[in-house]
Interface confidence: medium
């Protein structure tokens, strides 16, 4: 069986900074290397906008949670038909292929299955799904996700969420 894990599920970065989304997998059949697929899905709700109106969000999310949907994350869980879905990159053996939308971007799959952005861009905020596919190993949980939130800094003032404190930017 395949078991896919994203060890750090939640990343906040500043625009143009690098970030790596880690993904690890274990599989019972190791005769052939699996295909690693990273997909992007836009947030079902706007993470950043919600942070500026917590009261209304509280009411809405509490109502959703009260419905008793196990493990429901309203930012992540919705039908693909109501959000943007793209393939970011795939890796088979040592060959990494970027999806059409990401051609020209400095993005790659490093290690076995880690997705690395050398520079984040405005449209990168969303949910990233790491999928590991093997024809020899079809059982198990072959997918896990991480949330990425890219926030900007204007010349006047940082575009921050309430409670954040901006530190020095690294080169």
């Amino acid at each position: 069986a395949i078991q896919v894990t994203v060890p750090d599920p939640y990343h906040v970065v500043i625009l143009f900074q690098p970030v790596t989304l880690h993904c690890t997998y274990q599989m019972s059949n190791t005769l052939t290397a699996p295909i690693v697929i990273w997909k992007y899905k836009s947030f079902c709700r706007d993470r950043v906008a919600d942070a500026f109106s917590p009261a209304s969000v509280d009411n809405q999310l509490n109502a959703q949670l009260a419905a008793g949907n196990p493990g429901y994350n309203p930012y992540v869980e919705c039908q693909d038909s109501v959000r943007t879905v793209r393939v970011v990159a795939t890796k088979q053996g040592n060959a990494v292929t970027l999806g059409d939308y990401y051609q020209g971007r400095r993005i790659t799959i490093t290690g076995n299955a880690d997705l690395t952005f050398e520079q984040t861009a405005w449209g990168d905020s969303g949910v990233y799904y790491c999928s590991v596919v093997s024809a020899q190993d079809l059982d198990g949980n072959n997918e896990a996700y991480a949330e990425l939130i890219v926030l900007g800094r204007t010349s006047e003032a940082p575009e921050l969420l309430p409670g954040f404190r901006a530190g020095p930017l690294e080169d």
């Epitope: 750090d8 599920p9 970065v13 970030v19 942070a51 917590p54 509280d58």
Partner: antibody, heavy 115, light 106 residues
């Protein structure tokens, strides 16, 4: 293996300042949020401060906000907590912890604030 | 703050469930962890992170699950697992928050 080693604890005087350092190894340090968590004697865990992988975001617990500064050196794989205007209630064991959903802890360093 | 029971008890071999609720209400509240502390002053050990992920050195009898806004640590077939178990979560922004701890008596 992931290891986190804290240092810098000891006896401190009220009103003074302390600097704790956590040295990390066994993983790509710059990819992970790092945190400081403390535990006062006979008390529970209290989140103190956090910093994201590239040093651009920091956040602090209410008890230390305005007195604490968290920073990191990704080249040296270290994260530092500076705590000023020390109070008796800062007496605790301070732990370094990795990740937004913490998956690894250091052994801790004990800080005693007393005259 | 996170809410968890002050204490639970079980006989060896029984299944124990410890619940944790009340994570950050609107931002980042969907990722919980469980941390075991065997004795005061000893370093916490991560039993579960990211809701249901178990570090490789943790026995498979420990598992985590998320249902609505409540996270549950399940210990199937309790052994010498007496300890204080803390739940933790992302509160708001990148800040963390912990429960007061649950003492498990076997």
């Amino acid at each position: 293996a992931v290891t986190l080693d804290e240092s810098g604890g000891g006896l401190q005087t009220p009103g003074g300042a302390l600097s704790l350092v956590c040295k990390a190894s066994g993983f790509t340090f710059s990819d992970y949020q790092m945190n400081w968590v403390r535990q006062a004697p006979s008390k529970g865990l209290e989140w103190v401060a956090g910093i994201n992988g590239r040093s651009s975001w920091t956040d602090y617990g209410a008890a230390v906000k305005g007195r604490a500064t968290i920073s990191r050196d990704n080249g040296q794989s270290t994260v530092r907590l500076q705590l000023n205007n020390l109070r008796a209630e800062d007496t605790a064991t301070y732990y370094c912890a990795r990740g937004s959903s913490i998956d690894a802890w250091g052994h801790g360093t004990e800080v005693i604030v007393s005259t | 703050a996170l809410t968890q029971p002050a204490s639970v008890s079980a006989n060896p071999g029984e299944t124990v469930k410890i619940t944790c609720s009340g994570g950050g209400s609107y931002y980042g509240s969907y990722y919980y962890g469980w941390y075991q502390q065997k004795s005061p002053g000893s370093a916490p050990v991560t039993m579960i992170y990211n809701n249901n992920n178990r570090p490789s050195n943790i026995p498979s009898r420990f598992s985590g699950s998320l249902s609505g806004s409540t996270n549950t640590l399940t210990i199937t077939g309790v052994q010498a697992d007496e300890a204080v178990y803390y739940c933790g979560s992302i509160d708001s922004n990148i800040a963390g928050v912990f429960g007061a701890g649950t003492t498990l008596t076997v």
